[in-house]
Amino acid sequence: MRTEAQVPALQPPEPGLEGAMGHRTLVLPWVLLTLCVTAGTPEVWVQVRMEATELSSFTIRCGFLGSGSISLVTVSWGGPNGAGGTTLAVLHPERGIRQWAPARQARWETQSSISLILEGSGASSPCANTTFCCKFASFPEGSWEACGSLPPSSDPGLSAPPTPAPILRADLAGILGVSGVLLFGCVYLLHLLRRHKHRPAPRLQPSRTSPQAPRARAWAPSQASQAALHVPYATINTSCRPATLDTAHPHGGPSWWASLPTHAAHRPQGPAAWASTPIPARGSFVSVENGLYAQAGERPPHTGPGLTLFPDPRGPRAMEGPLGVR
């Protein structure tokens, strides 16, 4: 089932609302304002910690700061997954975990963060300068990856602060398309507000020629941009940068399930809200995200994406249709 945001026909104002602004002028700014406020770039943070007790033991914690539904998390070392990195663990929010030596225990900490304990000796043992990367596949944002490693001078028992240094493996059609739409929406909102300041709102007359209500000239996604939201996307492979120490999180013991940013208004509603994504064998984790978007049309997650075009008066509604099962 293909789910696309529909632009509802706006009803004419009730006859009794003399002098009041038309629905178009009332509804549209709020809709666009909602878009602007909720529009935030997703972020992935990574925290790497060497355990004081065992020098070959590491704990990696990763979290996703975004409004979409996480469908898969891949943790790798030695660089980004699909760019020379080796998969350590794959975590699915409904179906469980697959992990590979030297991973000892991968687990979900919260709906948007995971932890992985690594233990090793000899060749499989992680060393202090190893880079660890976490990739979150989510709907509708696409795939976001960040990498981190211990600072060279860090003492055992200390951790690198969570580093939200995302590598842009952006869904070109999805993320850039949605961003463009939101930018356009925000500009249009400003334009509307300015126009509203300069002249009084005209009364909308019900259409005599058509029984339907007049459709406001609100932004509606073009067929091209609607299609773009469903296109399997190209992954930009970039080199993995070690974690930087500038971080949005406090240095002294960060809350690593992450204090949510204000833009993350729509959180996944629970485990059932997460979409299912095909998972290739460990050696071929090249573009998990393509599967995510290829399925997006047929198998929408229970919760709608963070992009709410027209708020339902009953609140954010789950998209219809159960999670697909093959």
Partner: antibody, heavy 119, light 107 residues
Framework: EVQLQQSGPELVKPGSSVKISCEAS????????VDWVKQSHGKSLEWIGA????????SYNQKFEGKATLTVDKSSTTVYMELRSLTSEDSAVYYC????????????WGTGTTVTVSS | DIVMTQSQKFMSTSVGDRVSITCKAS??????VDWYQQKPGQSPKTLIH???SRHTGVPDRFTGSGSGTDFTLTISNIQSEDLADYFC?????????FGGGTKLEVK
Amino acid sequence: EVQLQQSGPELVKPGSSVKISCEASGYTFADYNVDWVKQSHGKSLEWIGAINPNDGGTSYNQKFEGKATLTVDKSSTTVYMELRSLTSEDSAVYYCARWVNNDWYFDVWGTGTTVTVSS
Amino acid sequence: DIVMTQSQKFMSTSVGDRVSITCKASQNVRSAVDWYQQKPGQSPKTLIHSASSRHTGVPDRFTGSGSGTDFTLTISNIQSEDLADYFCLQHWNYPYTFGGGTKLEVK
């Protein structure tokens, strides 16, 4: 037809080692992980570990670390499990099973190999 | 480790009946539970994966349900060939663990 053909029964002495095999056919070998499961006589099943045929990456149940070693030979599309320092507790039927990465489950099971440890 | 408890070790039923085999996880395992059937002297066969998805070729008499900690395999219109052991498996966390099994006896 997808098949996992396991090697025949083994009768071994305590303290020795045994290497059993699981030959895959009917599918692209590298696309699926292979897991191993132990079934002691009259008992339930125990997950031993998994191997990824692509790179030989392994994952073990801690209980079987040091007991079982998983290896792969891509040229013969065969996965091996070596069991060492055998005791009577290791007498069991051992199964290999194909793990579906897309759907997260075992869809095909091997024929099973009976290992008997006896002096 | 997560413990998967199949409280009924044996269940007796008649042809045409309906039976529900239960499996309880010691902690929340979402829908990461599969059901396997093992007939005497044979390898296990896959029935249900992801708690409720029927494996290819499995008759629709077999139905899986549940999520979190409580899972059920329901067999309706039981046939004599359903005489077997039934195991649940969780793969939510490592190590993966199986239930103790339920032996279905058909009168």
